[in-house]
Every structure is written in C-alpha cells, then in structure tokens.
C-alpha cells in the first residue's frame, strides 16, 4: 500500500491561521493512523480519521506548531511514515505610513513606515518610494535574536516640493519566505502627498478710508496666499500689546464708530502649517454731542414710588452733569453720574417733586440743557367694598365703596353697579386748596332679594387725568352677591313607618329649604329634655331597632340666616315576654289569709294584662289593678288555677299558677279539681 500527504512535504503557515495536514493511503481498506512531531512534543492540534484519510487540524497556528509532523499509517503488519515540515511566519497587516507633521514645501519631514507583528523579521525588507523613486530600502538582518512578533519600522527624512503634490508615498514590505508561491509575502501601503504652503503675501484693502468720523462705518477686506487657502482672522491690537479677536471672515465691517475704535487692526492668514499677518491703522475723529432725557419730556409719577430721570450724552467721551428745578427749589433727590449717563432718583416721590427738572451737560467748552416735567398722581389700590352685615333676603344692608389715598381728588368719580344697573354715582368736583392724599367713599343702602344671588356688585373708581401718561386710570373691585335665605319648610319622611316592630330598620330623611343649602343635624330628645346629636346626614338610618330606640327624634336645618326644626316620634313595639305570675306570700296559704296574685310584663309598656281563674264551668276574668288581684280572707273555693295573659298589637304571652288553700279544721288541704 502507499501513503500520501497534503501538502506533500512543507507547509508555510501564518500565525493565527487554521492549518490542516492530511494523510491518506491507497491499497489499504482500513488503515490505522497516528501523528507525532519529530521531537515528540505535543501535537497542539486535533486529529480526525475518516476511512483512508486522517487530518490534523491546528487552529490557531502558533509557535507550538513549528515542527516536522510525522504521519504513520499501519496496514495489518506493515507500517509507512511520511513527514510534513510546518514552518511559521507572521505578516498579518499592510504597513502603515506616518508623517511627523503636515508636508510643507521647503521644510524637512520624517516619514515612518511600520510593519506590525512580523516574524521572522530577519527575513523582512522594507522599501519606501516616492512615486517611482526609491527613497530608502532596509533589511532587518541583525535584529532577530529570538522568535517573537515585533513591529519593524523604516524612517526617511525628505524635503517636499510643490511638484510632489499628487505623488504617492509607497511603503512596500517583503517577507523573504517565498519558496511557496501561494503565500502573500509582499504587502504595501500607499499615501497620497498633500503638500502645503504657509500663508504669505497678506494684503488689506480699506473702504472708504483709514481716517473716519465718529458714527461712520468702514469695511476692511483681507486676502492671503497659501495652500490650503488660508483662513482669515481679524483682531485689534490692545494698549498692552495683546490681540483682541474680532472676526473669522475675510471682510470686517465696523459701524457707528467711536473714538475708541481708533487703533491698529491686524489681519492674519492662517492654514494648517503657518500664519502671516498684515496691520492697518484706523483713526476715528470726534463728532458734535447730543443730550437725551428719559423717560421723555413729561412723566406721570405715583406718589410714594421711585422715579429715575436719566440724562444721556452721545458724542462726548467725558461729559459733566448738573441738575436743577426750573424754579430753583431744592432737588429732593439723589444724583448719580457715570460715564455718559447721569440719573436723578426721586424716592419716594412726594408733592415737593412736582416740578420741571433740568439737566445741564458740559462737554469741553460746549453746554446743552434738556428738561422734563414731573406730574403727580396717587391711585395706588383698587376700591374696597364693605357691607354692614351678611346679605339676608329682605333685610336692608349698607354698602360702602372706599377709594384710598387719591390725588388729585377733584378728578375722582366713584360708581356702584349691581349687575348692569347703576345704583349710585358720585364725582368729587369740589376745589381743594391743599395738596394731600385723601380717602373717599360712596355709601348706599339697599334691600337684597333672592334674585340678586350671583349678580356682581361692582365699585368703579375713575381718575379723569387723560393728559397724564400712566396706568391704570380706572380701578374696580367686584363682589359676587350671595343672598342668604333662612331654612324653612323642614319636613321629615319616615320609611316604612314611625311605628315599628322591634328588629326592623327605619330611614328618616330630613328636607329643608334655604340658601345657602341648610346643613342637616339629627338629634334625639333625652328623657331630661336635652338633645343628643346623632348625625349630620340628611338621612338617619336605624338598623335592627330595639325598644329603647323609641322616642322623639329631631331634625334641624341650619344656615347663616337661621334655623328650622321638625320632630318625629318613633315607636318600637315588642311582643310581651318575661311575664312573671306570682302569689304573695305563697302559692300555698291557709283559709282566711290574704293573697295577692300579681302579673307583670318586664319588657313592654302598653300591654293589656288579663287575669283569669280557670274552672270547668268557664274562666272568670278577675279585676286587676296594674296586673295585681288581691284575695282577702281566702276561702277554700279560691283554690285553683290562675292564668295571666299579657297582650299587645304585636303578640301575647300566657303564664299560670296553682293556688292551694288549706282548711283550718282537720288540717285538710283543698286543691282545685284540675
């Protein structure tokens, strides 16, 4: 028989890959296979046998698989052996090209080409080309002092030129283990060259001129040459030499220029690799100044408030300010001047501030004056509505509408409305010599009705000073009317009835009319006349009533306007029980003794008690007082059976006793024949 291996004698395997070695026989139906390494180290692989083929799979391949593997096939008594040499290499990735920085025309740059995790690196050769030109080639012959996966690099320094744009850097790595064609032993990386030029020839154009007037505008445009095209940045040189960034556009426009905008402006062209700057000086000349007073020529100020009058200067760098009144009375305010603004604060505003105020501004040799008229008013709060008492249907009530702290008084009007109807209107036209804050009222009496409920009572106050600018000139208060109606028509519904048998349930519902809706209060009248509160629900429910629940129940409807009550008597009826029928002093007496036969029904009032003496000839109803029947001087015929019946509408109960009367002679006893 014959033995064959695939591959035949040598296998070049990359670390990390999966490798299969196959051993097969011909001329032997069922061979026995075994695998070993020439140095009898572990196989570091998995063997699978199938018929006349045996496969040794190593996954992943590592240094532990660098052996001569021997396959032995045994066919009956004959043995054949064949070896495959597994050689290891590692060349997993393409090289990587790194530049020490951007490529600038005329400036040296270092290119580094790295090949990672390579083995055996003493067989490695790295070539670095620029276009078709070989810049450097290196073999790493002296490095391999051990078997390991290392990163090997080649470095070249060169000076790029403009002509290099579009050319490519090629790093070609070769691993000289190419006895077998199937192994990719050459790998390469390509990088296109992008050559940069640092910004230069930076130019500024200024329109209309570098000499400008205050309030004017200027447009400055900057350009710079470079590759890639430079970005433009504008800044201004500060007094301390530092630059203040202004813009990232090629064009810088300054509007409404001031004196302080004068100075040196710097334009800088910047790209990835450099910068280049150009400077221009702008001179801004002075312009005449103006004065503004705010909030305007007139101001309406509420007494007690704080008012700020502001005097602003435009076109003057360091003005000086002064304030006075037109009649040169004291200012009664606080002046604060800062830069081009001065403020006069009147706080709190009072009658002494009702003036025309003048602000005088001095700028150099020039003086300007502006005035403002302060007019006063006081209308600080909404009117206050007060009523002499609660609103009750048909009862008169006095309504007062008070407007507090008003000025000027002769401009005040107060109006009282109910819904859309005007009830009263008053104007306070009387002249007043004094300047003072006064409280003014409107008062009236009216009789509310139920129909008034829900209507609005409105008190409206107006201050007729339309020539003054302030808000509000009209204030109002509203109160919704709720007219109270005392409880009435209080009724009680008892279901099923006010007379009940013990154990049944009863619902007592109380209804009462009134506004606001009356609150219901149920109580029970105690024997001493006091009321025991039970419930605040309209319906009072008694479940499984007892005799003790009998009595007078009281329902009361209550609201702010009054109260109304209704009583109902509840009677709980009980079947007579606990009947006691007794003979006093004994049920066995001597002839001539006095005997009291007494019948009582413990639990039930209102029961009929009927006492009878039983006899063959018929029963005799005895006259009893409160269930007691007295036999004076008992005779022998009084002996016999006595029966008591306790009876009411609900039921009845019987009790009987036997009276025994003994004769005086012969000591003979006489019993009733029964």
């Amino acid at each position: 028989f014959k033995i064959e291996t695939t591959p035949e004698s040598r296998y070049l395997a990359q670390i990390g890959d999966s490798v299969s070695l196959t051993c097969s026989t011909t001329g032997c139906e069922s061979p026995f296979f075994s695998w070993r390494t020439q140095i009898d180290s572990p196989l570091n692989g998995k063997v699978t046998n199938e018929g006349t083929t045996s496969t040794l799979t190593m996954n992943p391949v590592s240094f532990g698989n660098e052996h001569s593997y021997l396959c032995t096939a045994t066919c009956e008594s004959r043995k054949l052996e064949k070896g495959i040499q597994v050689e290891i290499y590692s060349f997993p990735k393409d090289p990587e090209i790194h530049l020490s920085g951007p490529l600038e025309a005329g400036k040296p740059i270092t290119v580094k080409c790295s090949v990672a995790d390579v083995y055996p690196f003493d067989r490695l050769e790295i070539d670095l080309l620029k276009g078709d030109h070989l810049m450097k080639s290196q073999e790493f012959l002296e490095d391999a002092d051990r078997k390991s996966l290392e990163t090997k690099s080649l470095e070249v320094t060169f000076t790029p030129v403009i002509e290099d744009i579009g050319k490519v850097l090629v790093c070609r790595a070769k691993l000289h283990i190419d006895e077998m064609d199937s192994v990719p032993t050459v790998r390469q990386a390509v990088k296109e060259l992008q050559v940069y030029i640092s910004p230069k020839n930076t130019v500024i154009s200024v329109n209309p001129s570098t000499k400008l007037q205050e309030g004017g505008s200027v447009t400055m445009t900057c350009s710079s040459e470079g590759l890639p095209a430079p970005e433009i940045f504008w800044s201004k040189k500060l007094d301390n030499g530092n630059l203040q960034h202004l813009s990232g556009n090629a064009t810088l426009t300054l509007i409404a220029m001031r004196m302080e905008d004068s100075g040196i402006y710097v334009c800088e062209g910047v790209n990835l690799i450099g910068k280049n700057r150009k400077e221009v000086e702008l001179i801004v000349q002075e312009k005449p100044f103006t004065v503004e007073i705010s909030p305007g020529p007139r101001i309406a100020a509420q007494i007690g408030d704080s008012v700020m009058l502001t005097c602003s200067v435009m076109g003057c760098e360091s003005p000086s300010f002064s304030w006075r009144t037109q009649i040169d009375s004291p200012l009664s305010g606080k002046v604060r001047s800062e830069g081009t603004n001065s403020t006069l604060t009147l706080s709190p505003v009072s009658f002494e501030n009702e003036h025309s105020y003048l602000c005088t501004v001095t700028c150099g040799h020039k003086k300007l004056e502006k005035g403002i008229q302060v007019e006063l008013y006081s209308f600080p709060r909404d009117p206050e509505i007060e009523m002499s008492g609660g609103l009750v249907n048909g009862s008169s009530v006095t309504v007062s509408c008070k407007v507090p702290s008003v000025y000027p008084l002769d401009r005040l009007e107060i109006e009282l409305l109910k819904g859309e109807t005007i009830l009263e209107n008053i104007e306070f036209l009387e002249d007043t010599d004094m300047k003072s804050l006064e409280n003014k009222s409107l008062e009236m009496t009216f009789i509310p009705t139920i129909e008034d409920t829900g209507k609005a009572l409105v008190c409206q106050a107006k201050l007729h000073i339309d020539d003054m600018e302030f808000e509000p000139k009209q204030r109002q208060s509203t109160q919704t009317l709720y007219v109270n109606v005392a409880p009435r028509d209080t009724t009680v519904l008892v279901s099923p009835s006010s007379i009940l048998e013990e154990g049944s349930s009863v619902n007592m519902t109380c209804l009462s009319q009134g506004f606001p809706a009356p609150k219901i209060l149920w109580s029970r009248q105690l024997p001493n006349g006091e009321l025991q509160p039970l419930s605040e629900n309209a319906t009072l429910t008694l479940i499984s009533t007892k005799m003790e629940d009998s009595g007078v129940y009281l329902c009361e409807g209550i609201n702010q306007a009054g109260r109304s009550r209704k009583e109902v008597e509840l009677i709980i009826q009980v079947t007579p029980k606990d009947i006691k029928l007794t003979a006093f002093p004994s049920e066995s007496v001597k002839e001539g003794d006095t005997v009291i036969i007494s019948c009582t029904c413990g639990n039930v009032p209102e029961t009929w008690i009927i006492l009878k003496k039983k006899a063959e000839t018929g029963d005799t109803v005895l006259k009893s007082i409160d269930g007691a029947y007295t036999i004076r001087k008992a005779q022998l015929k009084d002996a016999g059976v006595y029966e008591c019946e306790s009876k009411n509408k609900v039921g009845s109960q019987l009790r009987s006793l036997t009276l025994d009367v003994q004769g005086r002679e012969n000591n003979k006893d006489y019993f009733s024949p029964e």
Epitope: G16, E87, A116, D117, K147, T151
Partner: antibody, heavy 113, light 112 residues
Framework: EVQLVESGGALVKPGGSLKLSCVAS????????MSWVRQSPEKKLEWVAE????????HYPDTVTGRFTISRDNAKNTLYLEMSSLRSEDTAMYYC??????WGQGTSVTVSS | DVVMTQTPLTLSVTVGQPASISCKSS???????????LNWFLQRPGQSPKRLIY???KLDSGVPDRFTGSGSGTDFTLKISRVEAEDLGLYYC?????????FGGGTKLEIK
C-alpha cells in the same frame, strides 16, 4: 534610560487572583514583543507568557494556559499579567522582559494558605 | 518540551583561571529558517538575570570578550577565559527554537 518596572506582587491564597503590571520606559514599547518569566524559590527559571508588539497574539506554556492572561496598553507603555486559580507552585519572582535582552527587577508572588 | 541540561551544577574557580559550562538540549536547536536560538544568562546575587550571549555565540553589548559561546545542534558551551570576581552567580542557558521556550537548571559559579 531603558528600564522595566514591575509591581502588583503579593501574598495570595490558593485559588485566588492577582494582576501584575510592568511599566516600560526609554524605548519604543509598541515595537517589541514582551514576556513574563518567573523564578521559583529553588531558582528555576520558567517562561510563562509572551505577547506580540500590537497585542494581537499571545503565547503561553501548558502550565499556565487558561489561568494566566498577558495583555498590554501601548498608549500607557504598560504590560500586564492577570493570574487566576493560583496554586502553590505559582509562588515565584515574576520578571517582565523585552525579549530576553532586557529584564525588570521582578515582583514577588507568594501563594499560600 | 525541550529539556535543557546544564553541567556542572556548581563550578568553583580561582580568579584568573578559565571556566567552562556545558548545556545539552534534548533536541536539535537548529530551526527551519537556519537559526539556532540559544542564549546564555548570568544572574548575579540579588539581581535579575542578564543576557550575555544570544544566537549561540553573539555577545550582548557591554559584555566582556572573555565570555565566548559555541556549539551547534544539541551541544553548547559557555567559556570564560579568565574568571573575575564579578563573574560569580548563576549561569543559565535558554532555547527559543522549540515552543515552549525553556531554560536550563542553572550552574553556580563560585570563586575559590
């Protein structure tokens, strides 16, 4: 100065875990394969792990396979050895090495109950 | 695993005298690319091991030329032409041809 400094050695109970570190300086760490070698109290040397320059490939002897893991952080110039299921026979001085040409001063690991 | 056997276990030498340490491997250390990965190390007392020789006979930088390495296949030798006091310590051979890489058991060099 080219040097390797190990740390993380300790006394640990059998079955326990430990992570050793080795900081490299003075050479391009990312270009070299790195190893851990240990020396028993009896002064026997044993190679225990190796990692390729990029960290993509690792190699271990059978004695530690499945229990030890070698790794590296090229950005931090640091090599690691993570050890688990420790046995008394793992007691040794552990050295970090660049190939075999450069060795650290070692860090001591004692596995004992 | 490839076993590395060092002899002698201990070597006692007078300063100025030569010394020789043998290292035998259980298998040939010539690899498929034609290289023999055999190194020699010295561990001075209280220090970490230091490589003296790599690839059988190449001296590491800074190693005095009184150290020489030789051999091939399975038999290798480290020779010190004239021993100096600083040479005392443990000498180890190491193979990096067959995975896993293995060290010899060590030879202790003492100064008489």
């Amino acid at each position: 100065e080219v040097q390797l400094v190990e740390s993380g050695g300790a006394l640990v109970k059998p079955g326990g875990s430990l992570k050793l570190s080795c900081v490299a300086s003075g050479f391009t760490f990312s270009s070299y394969a790195m190893s851990w070698v240990r020396q028993s109290p009896e002064k026997k040397l044993e190679w225990v792990a190796e990692i390729s320059s990029t960290g993509s490939y690792t190699h271990y002897p059978d004695t530690v396979t499945g229990r030890f893991t070698i790794s590296r952080d090229n950005a931090k110039n640091t090599l690691y050895l993570e050890m688990s299921s420790l046995r008394s026979e793992d007691t040794a001085m552990y050295y970090c090495a660049r190939g075999e040409a450069l060795w650290g001063q070692g860090t001591s690991v004692t596995v004992s109950s | 695993d490839v076993v590395m056997t060092q002899t002698p276990l201990t070597l006692s030498v007078t300063v100025g005298q030569p010394a020789s340490i043998s290292c035998k491997s259980s298998h040939s250390l010539l690899d498929s690319y034609g290289k023999t990965y055999l190194n020699w190390f010295l561990q001075r007392p209280g220090q970490s091991p230091k490589r003296l020789i790599y690839l059988v006979s190449k001296l590491d930088s800074g190693v005095p030329d009184r150290f020489t390495g030789s051999g091939s296949g399975t038999d290798f030798t480290l020779k010190i032409s004239r021993v100096e006091a600083e040479d005392l310590g443990l000498y180890y051979c190491w193979q990096g041809t067959h995975f896993p890489w293995t060290f010899g058991g060590g030879t202790k060099l003492e100064i008489k």
